[in-house]
């Protein structure tokens, strides 16, 4: 059964989990630059489920796009370097979902472009946040 | 209602300059980019370049690179696509048209003719 | 460079199903849209992003992706369906626009 201690652990990983993404959801609207409508046309995968930590694995999977997206904002819209940031937010991703058990993603039919996408897991972060506190 | 709206056909020799415009209304002009795209007679869509009339960011394709100059004034919603020299292979139609990723609006297009 | 490639033209009867394939190899990670040229006339979006409908176009225009490949499919073809159709992506970099080279739509 999960402790105080680690259930406090979670929230505070998956808090700075969605801080991340808020930050990358942020620069991407403020971003002047041609690469921004050229982001809209990138395709991201959405998961068919979101509503456990295991689900992450379809976050991780996209991570490597989400990097190649990133690189076109020139990374003068955020704080770290595009590739520092996914680093990071991998780093939690993999923290969160735990690396014992496999679990395979499965992704709903329709894509997604990077806003909805970030918006989706936005809400996930939300969602798993309020189910701790 | 987003309009973009193009200035009318244009007759001109080879060697001689030409300015066209694409003015647009109905959303703010200054924080979406506009693209252009030409049409040869009986062929498909080429899309030349871009411009974000807010700073006159410009972008071309390597096709049209140094062919051709993209420019914009605010003040006056108003994008332009201009030669020094005409050739006879400009001949075409010239489109201007709303960028968000994809062209979501276009002007009726500007025939340009160059003949001697 | 970059392209996308379409059949040069398609044909179909009235009340039939009508699809028009546009391929390229960025296509499982990029976008595709989707404009319809009547003859004399400005393009149209018809599709954007794969398969969304822009208000106005009517529900028997929709459009699918699938690897590298992106169909528009016009269910139920009619008389004023007839024009030339371009598809619309960027290369994987998203650096450089293209259009598919069109299809002509015969509806007879």
């Known amino acids: 059964a999960p402790t105080s201690s680690s259930t406090k652990k979670t929230q505070l990983q998956l808090e700075h989990l969605l801080l991340d993404l808020q930050m990358i959801l942020n620069g991407i609207n403020n971003y002047k630059n041609p690469k921004l409508t050229r982001m809209l046309t990138f395709k991201f995968y959405m998961p068919k489920k979101a509503t456990e930590l295991k689900h992450l694995q379809c976050l991780e999977e996209e991570l490597k796009p989400l990097e190649e997206v990133l690189n076109l904002a020139q990374s003068k819209n955020f704080h770290l370097r595009p590739r520092d940031l996914i680093s990071n937010i991998n780093v939690i991703v993999l923290e969160l979902k735990g690396s014992e058990t496999t679990f395979m993603c499965e992704y709903a039919d329709e894509t997604a472009t990077i806003v909805e996408f970030l918006n989706r897991w936005i809400t996930f972060c939300q969602s798993i946040i309020s189910t701790l506190t | 209602e987003v309009q973009l709206v193009q200035s009318g056909a244009e007759v001109k020799k080879p060697g001689e300059s030409l300015k066209i415009s694409c003015k647009g209304s109905?959303?703010?002009?200054?924080?979406?980019?506009i693209g252009w795209v030409r049409q040869m007679p009986g062929k498909g869509l080429e899309w030349m370049g871009i411009?974000?009339?807010?700073?006159?960011?410009?972008r071309y394709s390597p096709s049209f690179q140094g062919q051709v100059t993209i420019s914009a004034d605010k003040s006056i919603n108003t994008a332009y696509l201009q030669w020094s020299s005409l050739k006879a292979s400009d001949t075409a139609i010239y489109y201007c048209?709303?960028?968000?990723?994809?062209?979501?609006?276009w002007g009726q297009g500007t025939l340009v003719t160059v003949s001697s | 460079s970059y392209e996308l490639t379409q059949p040069p033209s398609v044909s179909v009867s009235p009340g039939q199903t009508a699809r028009i394939t546009c391929s390229g190899d960025?296509?499982?990670?990029?976008?595709a849209y989707w404009y319809q040229q009547k003859s004399g006339q400005a393009p149209v979006l018809v599709i954007y992003?794969?398969?969304k409908r822009p208000s106005g176009i009517p529900e028997r225009f929709s459009g699918s992706s699938s690897g590298t490949m992106a169909t528009l499919t016009i269910s139920g073809a009619q008389v004023e369906d007839e024009a030339d159709y371009y598809c619309?992506?960027?290369?994987?970099?998203?650096?450089?626009?293209?259009f598919g080279g069109g299809t002509k739509l015969t509806v007879l």
């Open positions: 048209a709303r960028d968000t990723g994809y062209f979501d609006y």
């Open positions: 109905g959303y703010n002009f200054t924080t979406y980019w």
């Open positions: 411009i974000y009339p807010g700073d006159s960011d410009t």
């Open positions: 960025a296509l499982p990670r990029k976008f």
């Open positions: 992003e794969d398969r």
């Open positions: 619309y992506s960027t290369d994987r970099s998203g650096d450089h626009v293209v």
